[in-house]
């Protein structure tokens, strides 16, 4: 139509200027479009430079929209992680504070002379919860061995107990069960509770990490071309009022985000596993009941040792021989009164129930995040047409969009009419994140069955992605070298936060 040749480019000028570009680039009236490399080559208001600028801008706008959506999800996961982490740490800190407040009165020097051992145990539990690569059962066994050695010396100040005698005592300990049932009960319950708590919190960390890393994956050149065509070619072709057809937009974004959609299956598995493991937060071996009550098991153990002292001493002498007596030492330590025990069952505060129900609801809401992303971005960011099908922008003109909407994921983009997707070349970063999701899901499943897993080794999948494994700080990266259990008990790993303690020495 000859009349269209003189059509003004006023609207395009306005839009282009609003984007911050120089108006000197914009022709006064339409020009022939043979120079266009992305948009259809009819009469146009866009020069080559304008097309390139708008292509870059549309690419940047999609990446920003993608990052914004990811940021909302990341913020939700981070808030959840903080809430649960605060709660679990609070339970353990509360237990330690109770121990520090009540044990000196209940047990006197049996506690004060061993405060460092108790402090280190809580530090170990904190480290374990925070993802350090240490074996909880071994840690507890070392604590009891260390405590037995010191308490036995204290209960028998009249005896000379050289290293070889203490070594013998350590070897006898398992058969003697000096602390009664408390060590076994604590081991069984604590392993289940701590592994559930830490794997849940790590799951939140991994999910957040995956979202962050995936949001940084750049969109390819084919995607850039398709998005330019979707968003700005209508302006260049003189139909600036035409908004993209919904199905057209979906096909473009399904092509652009094909790799991201492949996260869907493993993402769902992870969230399902996280919801499932919250079942382990309740009951007598539940997180709240166990983590908040560590001190009661310790009190029970010391009481048992005092009650069993005479039998224990006789059995130790039977197994290790008669130790020498210090002539200046006093007689055996007087039996102390039993330390009063706080009730073992910690009444639930209601905080955890509230946290869990909120988390379950929010995790359910984001289960289909990756496959719903194209639709979400199209409806929220792309100003889709609400007009009848034949009035929207279909990539060539104003009119109906005929191609069918593609399925989700990389494999389904083989015939995507809008974005040329090489389905034989999956994005490596996203593959690595799929692997991270799988690994974390396996940890959660193990944790659900009460099994401890080596968190460090589990994340060494050879992918080299550097995706954190959900640790709360740098602890997971530190392989803790530990002695195998032996009679010479190494100290346990105290937490950096508990530093510069003054006061009672407990060597």
């Amino acid at each position: 139509d000859p009349a269209s040749k003189s059509r003004s480019c006023g609207e395009v000028r306005q839009i282009y200027g609003a984007k911050g570009f120089s108006l000197s680039d914009v022709p006064q009236a339409e020009i022939s479009g043979e120079h266009l490399r992305i948009c259809p080559q009819g009469y146009t208001c866009c020069t080559s430079e304008m097309e390139e600028n708008l292509a870059n801008r549309s690419h940047a706008e999609l990446e920003t929209a993608l990052r914004d959506s990811s940021r909302v999800l990341q913020a939700m996961l981070a808030t959840q992680l903080r809430s649960f982490d605060d709660h679990f740490q609070h339970l353990l800190n509360d237990s330690e504070r109770t121990l520090q407040a009540t044990f000196p009165g209940a047990f006197g020097e049996l506690y004060t002379q061993n405060a460092r051992a108790f402090r280190d145990l809580y530090s170990e539990l904190r480290l374990y919860y925070r993802g350090a690569n240490l074996h909880l059962e071994e840690t507890l066994a070392e604590f009891w061995a260390r405590l037995l050695e010191r308490l036995f010396k204290q209960l028998h100040p009249q005896l000379l107990l050289p290293d070889d005698y203490l070594d013998c005592l350590g070897k006898q300990a398992e058969a003697l069960r000096p602390f009664g049932e408390a060590p076994r009960e604590l081991r069984l319950r604590a392993t289940r509770a701590f592994v559930a708590a830490r794997s849940f919190v790590q799951g939140l960390g991994v999910a957040s990490d995956v979202v962050r890393k995936v949001a940084q994956v750049p969109l390819g050149p084919e995607c850039s071309r398709a998005v330019m065509k979707l968003v700005y070619c209508a302006h260049c072709l003189g139909v600036p009022g035409a908004r993209p057809c919904p199905d057209y937009c979906r096909n473009v974004l399904k092509g652009c985000l094909a790799n991201q959609a492949d996260l869907d299956a493993e993402w769902r598995n992870l969230l399902d596993s996280m919801v499932l493991i919250t079942d382990k937060f309740w009951g007598t071996s539940g997180v709240e009941s166990v983590i908040g009550s560590v001190h009661t098991w310790l009190a029970e153990a010391i009481n048992a040792l005092q009650d069993n002292r005479d039998t224990l001493t006789a059995k130790v002498i039977q197994g290790c021989g008669n130790p020498k007596v210090n002539p200046q030492g006093p007689g055996p330590e007087e039996k102390r009164r039993r330390g009063k025990l706080a009730p073992r069952e910690r009444p639930p505060s209601g905080t955890l129930e509230k946290l869990v129900s909120e988390a379950k609801a929010q995790l359910r809401d984001v289960q289909d995040f990756w496959i719903s992303l194209p639709g979400t971005l199209c409806s929220e960011k792309m100003a889709l047409s609400t007009a009848s099908d034949d009035r929207c922008w279909n990539g060539m003109a104003r009119g109906r969009y005929l191609p069918e909407v593609m399925g989700d994921g990389l494999a389904n983009q083989i015939n995507n009419p809008e974005v040329e997707v090489d389905i034989t070349k999956p994005d490596m970063t996203i593959r690595q994140q799929i692997m991270q999701l799988k690994i974390m899901t396996n940890r959660l499943r193990s944790a659900y069955n009460g099994n401890d897993v080596d968190f460090q080794d589990a994340s060494d999948d050879g992918s080299g992605s550097g995706s954190g494994d959900g640790c709360l700080d740098d602890l997971c990266s530190r392989k803790v070298s530990r002695k195998s259990s032996s009679s010479r008990t190494p100290l346990t790993h105290a937490l950096p936060g508990l530093s510069e303690q003054e006061g009672q020495k407990t060597s």
């Epitope: 020097e109 002379q113 460092r116 051992a117 280190d120 530090s123 480290l127 260390r146 050695e149 010191r150 010396k153 204290q154 100040p157 000379l160 107990l161 290293d163 203490l166 210090n326 030492g329 803790v480 070298s481 530990r482 002695k483 010479r488 008990t489 190494p490 100290l491 346990t492 790993h493 105290a494 937490l495 950096p496 508990l498 530093s499 510069e500 303690q501 003054e502 006061g503 009672q504 020495k505 060597s507």
Partner: antibody
Framework: QVQLVQSGAEVKKPGASVKVSCKAS????????MHWVRQAPGQGLEWMGE????????TYNQKFKARVTMTRDTSTSTVYMELSSLRSEDTAVYYC????????????WGQGTLVTVSS | DIVMTQSPSSVSASVGDRVSITCRAS??????LAWYQQIPGKAPRILIS???ILQSGAPSRFSGSGFGTDFTLTISSVQPEDFATYYC?????????FGGGTKVEIK
């Protein structure tokens, strides 16, 4: 066998800081607390503090608390003691010492590092 | 802080003599006491832990005794290599503290 090897002698000006290292070998580094003890010329022994090598958890003698920092590097099995705001009375031999078993008794000692503070 | 008081501050002895050094704690420390020997220019070396337990490598002529607040280190027959300074140390409470030292000199 257990060995603790300390860094060489240092001469410092008043107000400066010094960082002494102690490299451990022959045992599980993270398994035992490490302590720092100093000895001024012709004087007795003075305990400065301890560090848990596996995590860096520290307990300091109140006398030094404002000026001392003990750290460790598990990758090299080394502990460090840094003393700041040095004064002439800090001139001493500084020893690292490892506990025997969990008992606050020092079975293994470094060879000592002489720190001289002089203007 | 627990103050550890050693006496005498120095003692002169001949080879073969019996020498005793005492250490008094300002408060009850049970048996949490160690004894060290220091030769000039060398690091201290542990002799006794838990007040009376001889450490491996320490000669049997050294012995420790005591409990609570009063402790003694005895050298049954002084040898030439024993002329050194001896320190006691309490391991009961922070800060760990040492006695002022006792110098065993050749008469």
């Amino acid at each position: 066998q257990v060995q603790l090897v300390q860094s060489g002698a240092e001469v410092k000006k008043p107000g400066a800081s010094v960082k002494v290292s102690c490299k451990a070998s022959g045992y599980t580094f993270t398994g035992y607390y490490m302590h720092w003890v100093r000895q001024a010329p012709g004087q007795g022994l003075e305990w400065m503090g301890e560090i848990n090598p596996s995590t860096g958890d520290t307990t300091y003698n109140q006398k030094f608390k404002a000026r001392v920092t003990m750290t460790r590097d598990t990758s090299t099995s080394t502990v460090y003691m840094e003393l700041s705001s040095l004064r002439s009375e800090d001139t001493a031999v500084y020893y690292c010492a490892r506990e025997k078993r969990d008992d606050g008794v020092f079975a293994y000692w470094g060879q000592g590092t002489l720190v001289t503070v002089s203007s | 802080d627990i103050v550890m008081t050693q006496s005498p501050s120095s003692v002169s002895a001949s080879v073969g003599d019996r020498v005793s050094i005492t250490c008094r704690a300002s408060e009850h420390i049970n048996g949490w006491l160690a004894w060290y020997q220091q030769i000039p220019g060398k690091a201290p070396r542990i002799l006794i832990s838990s007040a009376s337990i001889l450490q491996s490598g320490a000669p049997s002529r050294f012995s420790g005794s005591g409990f609570g607040t009063d402790f003694t280190l005895t050298i049954s027959s002084v040898q030439p290599e024993d002329f050194a300074t001896y320190y006691c140390q309490q391991a009961k409470s922070y800060p760990l503290t040492f006695g002022g030292g006792t110098k065993v000199e050749i008469k």
